[in-house]
C-alpha cells in the first residue's frame, strides 16, 4: 500500500530519493542505501519453508505504481508498503503478512482434518 494518501499516478520526483536496502541492494547502493526516482519500499513475504522474510529497498518510478499496489497473489502470502515522504522513510514501514485463509491451509504443506 502507499502511505500518506499519495495519488496512484506516478509522477517524476524533482530529486533523487535515498532508501534503506536489505536483501535487495542494487550494485549502485552504498552502505545499504540505494537511490531512486520512485519509491522506498519494505516487503514481508513467506519463503518456501513458510518463514517470514523482510526485504527493503528502492523501486524505480517505472512500474512502481503497480508494484506498490500490493495486489494479492494466489498461494503467496506477502505484503508491501511504499513511501516517498523523506529519505530512508522505509525504515518506519512495518508491513504484516495477510491472515491465512482456510484454503491456504489446505493447499499448504500441513493439512488440518
Amino acid at each position: 500500500k502507499k502511505e500518506d494518501g499519495e495519488s496512484t499516478a506516478p509522477t517524476a520526483r524533482p530529486k533523487v530519493l535515498r532508501c534503506k536496502c536489505h536483501h535487495h541492494c542494487p550494485e549502485d547502493s552504498v552502505n545499504n542505501i540505494c537511490s531512486t526516482d520512485g519509491y522506498c519500499f519494505t516487503m514481508i513475504e513467506e519463503d518456501d519453508s513458510g518463514t517470514p522474510v523482510v526485504t527493503s529497498g528502492c523501486l524505480g518510478l517505472e512500474g512502481s505504481d503497480f508494484q506498490c499496489r500490493d495486489t494479492p497473489i494466489p498461494h503467496q502470502r506477502r505484503s508491501i508498503e511504499c513511501c516517498t515522504e523523506r529519505n530512508e522513510c522505509n525504515k518506519d514501514l512495518h508491513p504484516t503478512l495477510p491472515p491465512l485463509k482456510d484454503r491456504d491451509f489446505v493447499d499448504g504443506p500441513i493439512h488440518h482434518k
Epitope: V16, P26, D28, S29, D37, C58
Partner: antibody, heavy 116, light 112 residues
C-alpha cells in the same frame, strides 16, 4: 531565475574552523539537494557531499567525513558547510550546487585561503 | 570510487572545426533505475562550471544545438559540431550514478 550566492573569499588560520554559506533563490529550496564541491588548481573537482534541505539528510564522500559538516537553514534558504581543523590542503575554491539527479546550477564559489 | 578518464587533456582547434571529447568510466554508469547519470559541464576561466548535457545526451536549457552527447555503459563522447570562440574553456564529465560522485580531470579546449 535560480541563483546560489556565495561569499567571494575567506582567509583563515591553520587549525581553526570556517563555515561557508550558500544562499539559494529562484526555486523551492526544499525541492532539491544541495551539494558541495572542492576545486584546487590542477586537482580537478571533488565531490564533498550533499544535503537534502527537506529532511536534513546528508551523504558524504568518505574522504571528507570528519572534515566537512553540512547543514541548512530553511527559513533563509541557506546551506552551510563547516570545515574543521584547517590546513593548507583545504585551501581551494568551494562551490555549492543544486542537485536533483544531476547538478544544474552552481554558485560562483568561495575561495578559501588557509594561511598563518 | 568510479574513476572518470577524459581524453584528450588538451584539444587545440580552429574556430569552425568539430571537436570531440571522450570520457570513460571505470564502472558502468547505468543506474538500477535504468537511467545513465553521465553529464557534461563547461568551465570558463574564473567562472563556475555550467551544465551542457545531462543524462548522456540531453541538452540543458539554453545550450546551443552544436553541442551533442552520446555513449552508453562506460564510454561517452561530447561533440561540438562547429567550435565558436565562446566555447573555449575546460570541459568536465561527471557521474551521479555511484556515490561518491566523481568528475573527469577536464579537457581544455583552446585555439590552435
Amino acid at each position: 531565475q535560480v541563483q546560489l550566492q556565495q561569499p567571494g573569499a575567506d582567509l583563515v588560520k591553520p587549525g581553526t574552523s570556517v563555515k561557508l554559506s550558500c544562499k539559494a533563490s529562484g526555486y523551492t529550496f526544499t525541492s532539491y539537494w544541495m551539494q558541495w564541491v572542492k576545486q584546487r588548481p590542477g586537482q580537478g573537482l571533488e565531490w564533498i557531499g550533499e544535503i537534502d534541505p527537506s529532511d536534513t539528510y546528508t551523504m558524504y564522500n568518505q574522504k571528507f567525513k570528519g572534515k566537512a559538516t553540512l547543514t541548512v537553514d530553511t527559513s533563509s534558504s541557506t546551506a552551510y558547510m563547516q570545515l574543521s581543523s584547517l590546513t593548507s590542503e583545504d585551501s581551494a575554491v568551494y562551490y555549492c550546487a543544486r542537485f536533483g539527479y544531476y547538478v544544474d546550477y552552481w554558485g560562483q564559489g568561495t575561495t578559501l585561503t588557509v594561511s598563518s | 570510487d568510479v574513476v572518470m578518464t577524459q581524453t584528450p587533456l588538451s584539444l587545440p582547434v580552429s574556430l569552425g572545426d568539430q571537436a570531440s571529447i571522450s570520457c570513460r568510466s571505470s564502472q558502468s554508469l547505468v543506474h538500477s533505475t535504468g537511467n545513465t547519470y553521465l553529464h557534461w559541464y563547461l568551465q570558463k576561466a574564473g567562472q563556475s562550471p555550467k551544465l551542457l548535457i545531462y543524462k548522456v545526451s540531453n541538452r540543458f536549457s539554453g545550450v546551443p544545438d552544436r553541442f551533442s552527447g552520446s555513449g552508453s555503459g562506460t564510454d561517452f563522447t561530447l561533440k561540438i559540431s562547429r567550435v565558436e570562440a565562446e566555447d573555449l574553456g575546460v570541459y568536465f564529465c561527471s557521474q551521479s550514478t555511484h556515490v561518491p560522485f566523481t568528475f573527469g580531470s577536464g579537457t581544455k579546449l583552446e585555439i590552435k
